[in-house]
Interface confidence: low
């Protein structure tokens, strides 16, 4: 899978979405979750209601929730309050039985407020993932890269 | 194989000036995070400031915020830190690192470059 | 900041358990997960991750290794200590800007 990276605003709102194929994964719940390591597990966050034909429905855990339209083939998972440790890289799954699969990597980054006149360095952004060598990148304004452009060019 | 190679260091007068490079190999540069992380003779580690894939985005700590600037180069692969107004206390071996996922808290330093010596003295 | 504090050495036998101790005045959990990570430094080298995330073993590393712990107490286990072992350890934690421990040196009896 290419990963495509989501930017948000410190203390804002975050939408994630991970489309996918309603027919194939019909009757499937969903989750998100968090990739700790190249290897490593991907650590449950929150996952679609029990009732698969309840998934519209909105589930929290914390400041995470997430929504499935099962008829429109979008999985969305809204990020509250977005804080630094909320950056990292996550998955989107349909689960069926024990298994997983996954739907869309995705890399959170949070951007400093610009309004906020606290120095930019209070807010710590660390470092990126092994599997991220063919990135796209969805700003929360809906701008994608083309494969091979530099994600985040600089400003300054 | 990634390798992270480290160039600039060497003896410099207290209030001038150095420029540290590391050219990175063996990985697609652009994608990930960078890092310095220095050490004083016969001390701990300590991180310095971290870089965002496009440099858009970088940090440091307290003792070095204005005197120090972390950027890198992506079509050369290159990472760099340009050090101000240098003081004695900066004597340290820099090194170049990695860093494992992009976020905020921290993630880890996966690769380590082998480091360059800075020292500060008149 | 948060403050890590290791103790300074520690020396034991070939073949024994070393156990070496970080402890943050500050939680670095976070959604269940401990941003507590720990490298090892031999004498003239860069440093190298071990344990990353409190407890998975990095790429390549021995299963002599091991982490455990969470929240402000962490734990580094290296056993049986061989004798390439001997290095300064660190911890290091993720959970705000990345600080390190002050070291430990692991010395053989």
């Known amino acids: 899978h290419n990963t495509t990276v989501f930017q948000g605003v410190a203390g804002q709102s975050l939408q994630v979405s991970c489309p996918y194929d309603s027919m194939k994964h019909w009757g499937r719940r969903k989750a998100w979750c968090r990739q700790l390591g190249e290897k490593g597990p991907c650590q449950r966050v929150v996952s679609t209601h029990n009732l698969w034909l309840l998934s519209f429905l909105r589930r929290w855990n914390g400041s995470t929730a997430i929504t499935d339209d099962t008829l429109g083939g979008t999985l969305t998972i809204t990020l509250r309050n977005l804080q630094p440790h909320d950056a990292g890289l996550y998955q989107c799954q349909s689960l069926h039985g024990s298994e997983a699969d996954t739907l869309r990597k995705v890399l959170v980054e949070v951007l400093a407020d610009p309004l906020d006149h606290r120095d930019a360095g209070d807010l710590w952004f660390p470092g990126e993932s092994e599997s991220f060598e063919d990135a796209h990148v969805e700003h929360s304004i809906s701008r994608s890269l083309l494969e091979g452009e530099i994600p985040f060019p600089p400003t300054s | 194989e990634v390798q992270l190679v480290e160039s600039g260091g060497g003896l410099v007068q207290p209030g001038r000036s150095m420029k540290l490079s590391c050219a990175a190999l063996?990985?697609?540069?652009?994608?990930?995070?960078m890092a310095w992380v220095r050490q004083a003779p016969r001390k701990g580690l300590e991180w310095v400031a971290s870089?965002?894939?496009?440099?858009?985005?970088?940090y440091y700590r307290d003792s070095v915020k204005g005197r120090f600037t972390i950027s890198r180069d992506n079509a050369k692969s290159t990472l760099y830190m340009q050090m101000d107004s240098l003081r004695s206390e900066d004597t340290a071996t820099y090194y170049c690192?990695?860093?494992?996922?992009?976020?905020?808290?921290?993630?880890?330093?996966?690769?380590w470059g082998q480091g360059v010596m800075v020292t500060v003295s008149s | 900041d948060i403050v890590l504090t290791q103790s300074p050495a520690l020396a034991v036998s070939l073949g024994q358990r070393a156990t070496i101790s970080c402890k943050t005045n500050?939680?670095?959990?976070?959604?269940?997960?401990?941003?507590m990570h720990w490298y090892q430094q031999t004498p003239g080298q860069q440093p190298k991750l071990l344990i990353y995330f409190a407890s998975n073993l990095a790429s390549g590393i021995p299963a002599r290794f091991s982490g455990r712990g969470s929240g402000t107490d962490f734990t580094l286990t290296i056993d049986p200590v061989e004798a390439d072992d001997t290095a300064t350890y660190y911890c290091?934690?993720?959970?705000?800007?990345?600080?390190f421990g002050g070291g430990t040196k692991l010395e053989l009896k």
């Open positions: 290091q934690q993720s959970r705000n800007l990345p600080t």
């Open positions: 063996g990985f697609t540069f652009s994608n990930y995070y």
């Open positions: 690192v990695r860093s494992f996922i992009v976020g905020t808290t921290g993630y880890y330093f996966d690769y």
């Open positions: 500050q939680n670095v959990d976070y959604y269940g997960n401990n941003y």
């Open positions: 870089i965002s894939t496009g440099g858009d985005n970088t």
